[in-house]
Amino acid sequence: DASQSSLTPLMVNGILGESVTLPLEFPAGEKVNFITWLFNETSLAFIVPHETKSPEIHVTNPKQGKRLNFTQSYSLQLSNLKMEDTGSYRAQISTKTSAKLSSYTLRILRQLRNIQVTNHSQLFQNMTCELHLTCSVEDADDNVSFRWEALGNTLSSQPNLTVSWDPRISSEQDYTCIAENAVSNLSFSVSAQKLCGGRSSLEGPRFEGKPIPNPLLGLDSTRTGHHHHHH
């Protein structure tokens, strides 16, 4: 069932700035008198279908009105999604004999952008380098998950990573930050050798990645970082 009873709303993800459809299913073989769409218990639209002509569509919410559309089956389409579109939607289909209720919860998620790694590293006299790396993305919220990996192992489940690197023991080592939400993920790798190499102390730059088509992008003169972007 694409649409759900009011007890268990269908969870629908929308991407900020894009479009989403809340799918509506009709009672089989019954003539529909009217359909009411509600947003957070406030009327959104009132539709009266006609067999021989176009349906009457009365949009009752001016805020979303210009961004509202309906499919041939009266599923709701909302374009240019905004964060304030998040919430509870309901459709009531009234027939001669019954009223069918469909419930939805719309969650708006941001496509992750601009992954950055900030580096504060120290090279000690014993040649051990202590790396303090912090990963961030633009407009991160609670639904963004961060982790740091090296050679397939998880080293951190947070935006930050603290790790010691000894060039005498370890060979070239890349540390990768992965930022992920339900609609996108970004990754950014930094090289321990390049962050620590040849300097007694380092207040590192901020490495920045932009989601552009290049799969590998050197982001500073020493090419210490590279970045990937996935949907």
């Epitope: 982790r147 951190s156 489940s157």
Partner: antibody, heavy 118, light 108 residues
Framework: QIQLVQSGPELKKPGETVKISCKAS????????MNWVKQAPGKGLKWMGW????????TYADDFKGRFAFSLETSASTAFLQISNLKNEDTATYFC???????????WGQGTPLTVSS | EIVLTQSPTTVAASPGEKITITCSAS???????LHWYQQKPGFSPKLLIY???KLASGVPGRFSGSGSGTSYSLTIGTMEAEDVATYYC?????????VGAGTKLELK
Amino acid sequence: QIQLVQSGPELKKPGETVKISCKASGYTFTNFGMNWVKQAPGKGLKWMGWINTYSGEATYADDFKGRFAFSLETSASTAFLQISNLKNEDTATYFCARRGGTAEFDYWGQGTPLTVSS
Amino acid sequence: EIVLTQSPTTVAASPGEKITITCSASSSISSNFLHWYQQKPGFSPKLLIYRTSKLASGVPGRFSGSGSGTSYSLTIGTMEAEDVATYYCQQGIYMPLTVGAGTKLELK
């Protein structure tokens, strides 16, 4: 090896406050978040929230906003759960669980049973 | 919040039997963020399978996981007496993190 060791059983009266500790060892404490999970007697697992062990920023599930507080003593690799104004329905076993890379609970404490009774 | 519905609620099986437990999510979940736990009576839960199909350290090979989107499953290839426990699925991509109500596996 990685271990999470929690403080012992607690018996409290309604209205009192309890503070449960969770001491971590075997890994870099500030690299992994810490979750708190409630299990009422005979019931399932309920996620209470988690704390970023580097920044100290806490995130609480809706049912655990207000009387519940997560905190840290980073130098001792210890996370704390404090529950104030205790109610009978707080009677449960509370677990700390380390947050893995994809928000799995990869290591668990042994649990701290809390009984709230007048 | 994402609701995870586990079925069956209880299952009784004999040693050697194949068992499958399902976990249905109210919204599509990235398979990287669906995990399974085993809790034996009187013990803490233990991570069993993470990222849908990866076995946690020390977990026997008779356990396996699969699924995508809104539908996931945990399979025990050949049930053993020591597998008597309650099994939980959990999603980690949406806040709040949520856990299924559990499936109790008993010995027939």
